[in-house]
Interface confidence: medium
């Protein structure tokens, strides 16, 4: 399946980046799994993943840096706690788990840029 | 002439962005003019410009937001005072002014991303 996501997103000065991951579904999937992968220096690592039932809330693990909501074939993803060293290509992977047939789609990635804030001066 | 510059640069949290603009010269130009143009929403505006003699310092106007140094066919440009609204494509234009023949080269642009910092909390 085709997965689309923005090419570039800037994290806020608080280290929060949000983007929409949209997929074209050939049918009425009831169970969908969304995974965010990070590619940097040709290494790919899993950032977070969530499986959700269509119409229900998207729930990541409690210790996940990701949160999200779903609306139809769109998933609104938010990644928090980002620092400059986390700058990289964040790829959205969508799997239509149920009912069969199984479909897999991978986006081209969203380049997330993160700038560390200057520390505030100490208050005397 | 061919002008190369990085495709993306992040401004620091202090609103400072630096990049190198490099040009291929067919001969020994003694007088070179460098102009930084900003393209946003299909509008192109001049950010700053400086003419320099090879081997001498690159001097912008006193009220310019740009500073720079030159080394051979490389110009190291720094733009200061940037805010989020200044995010855009910054294009390096190089003119070999003297001696003839005159050559003009325009780079593909550097996308500068600027994120406004969070204000520091007031000290009580």
């Amino acid at each position: 399946i085709q997965v689309t996501q923005p090419s570039v997103v800037l994290a806020s000065s608080r280290g929060i980046a949000s983007f929409v991951c949209e997929y074209a579904s050939p049918g009425k999937a009831t169970e969908v799994r969304v995974t965010v992968l990070r590619q940097a220096d040709s290494q790919v690592t899993e950032v977070c993943a969530a499986t959700y039932m269509m119409g229900n809330e998207l729930t990541f693990l409690d210790d996940s840096i990701c949160t999200g909501t779903s609306s139809g074939n769109q998933v609104n993803l938010t990644i928090q706690g980002l620092r400059a060293m986390d700058t990289g290509l964040y790829i959205c992977k969508v799997e239509l788990m149920y009912p069969p047939p199984y479909y897999l789609g991978i986006g081209n990635g969203t380049q997330i840029y993160v700038i560390d804030p200057e520390p505030c001066p100490d208050s005397d | 002439i061919q002008v190369t510059q990085p495709s993306v640069v992040l401004a620091s949290s202090r609103g400072i962005a630096s990049f190198v603009c490099e040009y291929a010269s067919p001969g020994k130009a003694t007088e070179v003019r460098v102009t930084v143009l900003r393209q946003a929403d299909s509008q192109v505006t001049e950010v700053c410009a400086a003419t320099y003699m090879m081997g001498n310092e690159l001097t912008f106007l006193d009220d310019s937001i740009c500073t720079g140094t030159s080394s051979g066919n490389q110009v190291n440009l720094t733009i200061q005072g940037l805010r989020a609204m200044d995010t855009g494509l910054y294009i390096c234009k190089v003119e070999l002014m003297y001696p003839p023949p005159y050559y003009l080269g325009i780079g593909n642009g550097t996308q500068i991303y600027v994120i406004d910092p969070e204000p520091c909390p007031d000290s009580d």
Epitope: - | I1, Q2, A24, P100, P101, L104, G105, I106
Partner: antibody, heavy 125, light 107 residues
Framework: QVQLKESGPGLVAPSQSLSITCTVS????????LSWVRQPPGKGLEWLGV???????NFHSALISRLTISKDNSKSQVFLELNSLQTDDTATYYC???????????????????WGQGTSVTVSS | DIQMTQSPASLSVSVGETVTITCRAS??????LAWYQQKQGKSPQLLVY???NLADGVPSRFSGSGSGTQYSLKINSLQSEDFGTYFC?????????FGGGTKLEIK
């Protein structure tokens, strides 16, 4: 319209000097360069040198010691002088307007966009 | 100095055919290349500048391509008036050397 016309001596003795004048119309020598090119009988083209709008010159490295190019802007004339002629300097000599072309917003490109009809020079005793 | 190597030196073709002439520079000339046509007993005429741009009045059956050190001139559906000698010339810093030329003859 742009026109260039060369006028030369036709026959020159070996070791002597060659002087050719190029008279132009339809453009100003204060705005454009003018190149000299020669072509020996039955052979290819050889770029000799150029004089720019401000009087600056560039020469073919093999001819730098023998070649002088100058001009008189008010008369719209450019002069080529080649010293110490040998038989292999026998050629048709052309002058050509040297234009910087601009396309897109990217580059200044050069070309010899208008040529004179050429003047034939034979070096012989 | 930059050397220009042009090939082939000569070409015998029929009207209506398509021909390609190539020019190789000894170093990168950044598309600063022109093509000229010269007919017997006449002065050269500019055909293409900046490697790909047709000069004013040049028919669209002519096209230039290339970058870096490799360039070519293509003539589609040759007409009788296209026969003559073709020269390339680099204009990337003086001296502005010409290629050796390609003589296009009617078969």
């Amino acid at each position: 319209q742009v026109q260039l016309k060369e006028s030369g001596p036709g026959l020159v003795a070996p070791s002597q000097s060659l002087s050719i004048t190029c008279t132009v119309s339809g453009f100003s020598l204060t705005s454009y360069g003018l190149s000299w090119v020669r072509q020996p009988p039955g052979k290819g083209l050889e770029w000799l040198g150029v004089i720019w709008y401000d009087g600056n010159t560039n020469f073919h490295s093999a001819l730098i010691s023998r070649l002088t190019i100058s001009k008189d802007n008010s008369k719209s004339q450019v002069f080529l002088e080649l010293n110490s002629l040998q038989t292999d300097d026998t050629a048709t000599y052309y002058c050509a307007k040297t234009e910087g072309h601009y396309y897109g917003s990217n580059y200044g490109y050069y070309a010899l966009d208008y040529w004179g009809q050429g003047t034939s020079v034979t070096v012989s005793s | 100095d930059i050397q220009m190597t042009q090939s082939p030196a000569s070409l015998s073709v029929s009207v209506g055919e398509t021909v390609t002439i190539t020019c190789r520079a000894s170093e990168n000339i950044y598309s600063n290349l022109a093509w000229y046509q010269q007919k017997q007993g006449k002065s050269p005429q500019l055909l293409v500048y900046a490697a790909t741009n047709l000069a004013d009045g040049v028919p669209s059956r002519f096209s230039g391509s290339g970058s870096g050190t490799q360039y070519s001139l293509k003539i589609n559906s040759l007409q009788s008036e296209d026969f003559g000698t073709y020269f390339c010339q680099h204009l990337w810093g003086t001296p502005y050397t010409f290629g050796g030329g390609t003589k296009l003859e009617i078969k």
